[in-house]
């Protein structure tokens, strides 16, 4: 008789989760020679230890500390790109502009990107059926706490000019409830960070509005200014051209506004 299992509102753990995490770790240590000291089995053991046998609504940042320690990584603090609701373009950008880094370009972000995971209290099983939804079930679930933890650490590490890519097609270009708005903004260190520069990405071909004047951007500016960090904003009217010009900056069409 199958034992009763808690039914959560969110999707279950990504299939082949352990194998995926291990394979991603192996690949990452191949691609990044500076991370070849990392033991991928230890990383998986620490990842597993953060949520296995624990109630999936009672996860803490402390649970992830062993994993954070193993995944400690130095990225150039002045080359950090944050993003909100526009992950794909941010990742396309750092794939071209190799000296800049999103969270998902770090080992821990790379391991967990697009994955879901949770366990069950008092059993060593991974729950592949369902996991807690942040809104409908609980916020202290394994996935949310992981991203809160790594996002906080990433923002704390930033210095000089920090860039953030924001989605100009959304009703709230800056959303206080996003990871960027609720975690990263509040963990930038004013003694290290001089400026936060927002890049507002336009969606429509003919959209020539200055989205830097959007009320939510003004709200972001206010929050940042109160934290003694300067704020600047740029419209990226043509994201496709923007990427093309990052690839080929000497192209003659790249001198005009993008």
């Amino acid at each position: 008789v199958p034992r009763w299992r808690q039914q959560w509102s969110g999707p279950g753990t990504t299939k082949r989760f352990p194998e995926t995490v291990l394979a991603r770790c192996v690949k990452y240590t191949e691609i990044h020679p500076e991370m070849r000291h990392v033991d991928c089995q230890s990383v998986w053991d620490a990842f597993k230890g953060a949520f296995i046998s624990k109630h999936p609504c009672n996860i803490t940042e402390e649970d992830y500390q062993p994993l954070m320690k193993l995944g400690t990584q130095t990225v150039p603090c002045n080359k950090i790109l944050l993003w909100s609701r526009i992950k794909d373009l941010a990742h396309q950008f750092t794939q071209v502009q190799r000296d800049m880094f999103t969270l998902e370009d770090t080992l821990l972000g790379y391991l967990a990107d697009d994955l879901t995971w949770c366990g069950e209290f008092n059993t060593s099983k991974i729950n592949y059926q369902s996991c807690p939804d942040w809104r409908k079930d609980c916020s202290n679930n394994p996935v949310s706490v992981f991203w809160k933890t790594v996002s906080r650490r990433f923002a704390e590490a930033a210095c000089d000019v920090v860039h953030v890519m924001l989605n100009g097609s959304r009703s709230k270009i800056f959303d206080k409830n996003s990871t960027f708005g609720s975690v990263e903004v509040h963990n930038l260190q004013p003694e290290k960070v001089q400026t936060l520069e927002a890049w507002v990405i336009h969606g429509g071909r003919e959209d020539s509005r200055d989205l830097c004047q959007d009320p939510t951007i003004k709200e972001l500016e206010s929050i940042i200014s109160k934290r003694n960090i300067q704020f600047s904003c740029k419209n990226i009217y043509r994201p496709d051209k923007f990427l093309q010009c990052v690839k080929n900056p000497e192209d003659s069409s790249c001198t005009s506004e993008i």
Partner: antibody
Framework: QVQLLQSGAELVRPGVSVKISCTGS????????VHWVKQSHVKSLEWIGV????????TYNQKFTGKATMTVDKSSSTAYMELARLTSEDSAIYFC?????????????WGQGTSVTVSS | DVVMIQTPLSLPVSLGDQASISCRPS???????????LNWYLQRPGQSPKLLIY???KRFSGVPDRFSGSGSGTDFTLKISRVEAEDLGVYLC?????????FGSGTQLEIK
């Protein structure tokens, strides 16, 4: 299943070079470094070096710098090792081995070995 | 380079007996990441080495539980609880903590 298939035995004259190959299958070749190891009666097993197929970057045992050159061809999932200016001391069995999942500098699966005999 | 001293050179055993092989590296094998990369391989005649034990005591997939590894610092041991015919061959210890990686000279396990 993971397999590393090496090229056949070589009988070569002193002073020339030889290039041996190691083709990986049953796993994502690009994501796993390939180690090379020499086995001779004199010195048992000696680590020559390791190459990462992703970018082709290498780490050599100093002892084999100038003697061995490791390369990869990602399109054919094949790693190569060229041995230069051969002498009788280079007569040995050469193994390729895949990096262990857990750690870059450990090895799990090995090829069957390629015998190199240097003789005039 | 780390020198791996393996003893004995040859180990005659009867089938069903316990066998014990020692490996002593010339320096600590504790890596900066906290792990100890001491591995054991079995090389049967005419074959390539097969991984048995990694990180001192972890059995590689498919390795029978009659094989066990132990030790710390600069003193490591491989034990075979009940020797079977298929266990015969040369046992090699290796370290992958320090570059260059190095191997012991091998222990020949043979029938008494």
């Amino acid at each position: 299943q993971v397999q590393l298939l090496q090229s056949g035995a070589e009988l070569v004259r002193p002073g020339v070079s030889v290039k041996i190959s190691c083709t990986g299958s049953g796993y994502s070749f690009t994501n796993y470094a390939v180690h090379w190891v020499k086995q001779s009666h004199v010195k048992s097993l000696e680590w020559i070096g390791v190459i990462s197929p992703y970018y082709g970057d290498t780490t050599y045992n100093q002892k084999f710098t100038g003697k061995a050159t490791m390369t990869v061809d990602k399109s054919s999932s094949t790693a190569y090792m060229e041995l230069a200016r051969l002498t009788s001391e280079d007569s040995a069995i050469y193994f390729c081995a895949r990096r262990f999942e857990g750690f870059y500098y450990s090895m799990d699966y090995w090829g069957q070995g390629t015998s190199v005999t240097v003789s005039s | 380079d780390v020198v791996m001293i393996q003893t004995p050179l040859s180990l005659p055993v009867s089938l069903g007996d316990q066998a014990s092989i020692s490996c002593r590296p010339s320096q600590s094998l504790v890596h900066s990441n906290g792990n100890t990369y001491l591995n054991w391989y079995l090389q049967r005649p005419g074959q390539s080495p097969k991984l048995l034990i990694y990180k001192v005591s972890k059995r590689f997939s498919g390795v029978p539980d009659r094989f066990s590894g132990s030790g710390s610092g600069t003193d490591f041991t491989l034990k075979i609880s009940r020797v079977e015919a298929e266990d015969l061959g040369v046992y090699l210890c290796s370290q992958s903590t320090h570059v260059p990686l190095t191997f012991g000279s091998g222990t020949q396990l043979e029938i008494k």
